[in-house]
Amino acid sequence: MKVLQEPTCVSDYMSISTCEWKMNGPTNCSTELRLLYQLVFLLSEAHTCIPENNGGAGCVCHLLMDDVVSADNYTLDLWAGQQLLWKGSFKPSEHVKPRAPGNLTVHTNVSDTLLLTWSNPYPPDNYLYNHLTYAVNIWSENDPADFRIYNVTYLEPSLRIAASTLKSGISYRARVRAWAQCYNTTWSEWSPSTKWHNSYREPFEQH
């Protein structure tokens, strides 16, 4: 039994780091493998993660971490019974994938303005809380070409757009994702999408 693709890990910078790797053949990850992880610190103790299958030869493990700060460094040991298959380390702050924003809501009752709001996925005491920026994706269910991205570079989790920038009388969907420049993170997953019917009063044409 050998590791074909070494574990790569990403952290949500809050409580979970996810590690994925591939074995050289079909493997029952949960029964055959264990990933041990330990914070590099005199008084830390080793924790065991039981991996799950992620495709025939792929494994994924969700490492529980109580909190994360930028200096944290973990040792990782991948075991198959008594055999050490791989040894490495992981610094969560260098591999951050933020949590996806939630509670995306479209408010359509504000005089021809669409107000989109969502929730910051981090509690106020987390470092990322004040460092997230967002991308909002709006698309038409009827017209695949009607697809747009709005970059929200301010901290407030909201976006205002004129309803007239979208077509009237048709349904749209929106979703939002986050990233943090300070840790050069990857983008989060998209939030669940929300749907609304776009309608607004056309301005009177003058002849």
């Epitope: 008084l43 103790e45 109580d66 700060v69």
Partner: antibody
Framework: EVQLLESGGGLVQPGGSLRLSCAVS????????MSWVRQAPGKGLEWVSA????????YYADSVKGRFTISRDNSKNTLYLQMNSLRAEDTAVYYC?????????WGQGTLVTVSS | QSVLTQPPSASGTPGQRVTISCSGS????????VNWYQQLPGTAPKLLIY???HRPSGVPDRFSGSKSGTSASLAISGLRSEDEADYYC???????????FGGGTKLTVL
């Protein structure tokens, strides 16, 4: 809200024993290392002892080694310090502290006075 | 005699910037992260700076920490009367397998 509440301090004669307790709430006690730090009257801070989250790793300052024993009961969210063969120089306020690489939360302390 | 060396006292006037130094060796500051604690009169210590330069939430950005080699320093800008307190540096010492503190610096706001 994180709270650490020390108890068990008091006046004891040289050579005597005392057991300090620290009741913890507001975080998952069993996930974190814990420590005791003391401060003699008018003096600076002195680290006493530390214990890992599961109790598997324990360290002591040379000044208390062989006399003090740190322990924890994760089911009761409580940290303990058993102090034997107490000396006058052990007189101090004893603080329990949540430990990461640093002490991020402290209790208000309990005063131990060793005097005849 | 503390393993880490701090000046016993420091002072400044409101609005001023003051710096407190902390000197150690390769077995402590040189190879570990430095933390700073503030102890206001009659209260328990409080974490002020962790891992050399990071502030816990709620600590004003007037406080900053840095480390170079076997020394560290705490800087307080825009000094205020409520900053009058004892300040301690601390870190792990690999050769002692112990956490070590500086002797503390009493900051007076004139």
């Amino acid at each position: 809200e994180v709270q650490l509440l020390e108890s068990g301090g008091g006046l004891v004669q040289p050579g005597g024993s005392l057991r300090l307790s620290c009741a913890v709430s507001g975080f998952t006690f069993s996930n974190y290392a814990m420590s005791w730090v003391r401060q003699a009257p008018g003096k600076g801070l002195e680290w006493v002892s530390a214990i890992s989250s599961g109790g598997g790793n324990i360290y002591y300052a040379d000044s208390v080694k062989g006399r003090f024993t740190i322990s924890r009961d994760n089911s009761k969210n409580t940290l303990y310090l058993q102090m034997n063969s107490l000396r006058a120089e052990d007189t101090a306020v004893y603080y329990c502290a949540k430990l990461r690489r640093y002490f991020d939360y402290w209790g208000q302390g309990t005063l131990v006075t060793v005097s005849s | 005699q503390s393993v880490l060396t701090q000046p016993p006292s420091a002072s400044g006037t409101p609005g001023q910037r003051v710096t407190i130094s902390c000197s150690g060796s390769s077995s402590n500051i040189g190879n570990n992260y430095v933390n700073w604690y503030q102890q206001l009169p009659g209260t328990a210590p409080k974490l002020l700076i962790y891992d050399n330069s990071h502030r816990p939430s709620g600590v004003p950005d007037r406080f900053s920490g840095s480390k170079s080699g076997t020394s560290a320093s705490l800087a307080i800008s825009g000094l205020r009367s409520e900053d009058e307190a004892d300040y301690y540096c601390g870190t792990w010492d690999a050769s002692l397998s112990a956490y070590v503190f500086g002797g503390g610096t009493k900051l007076t706001v004139l």
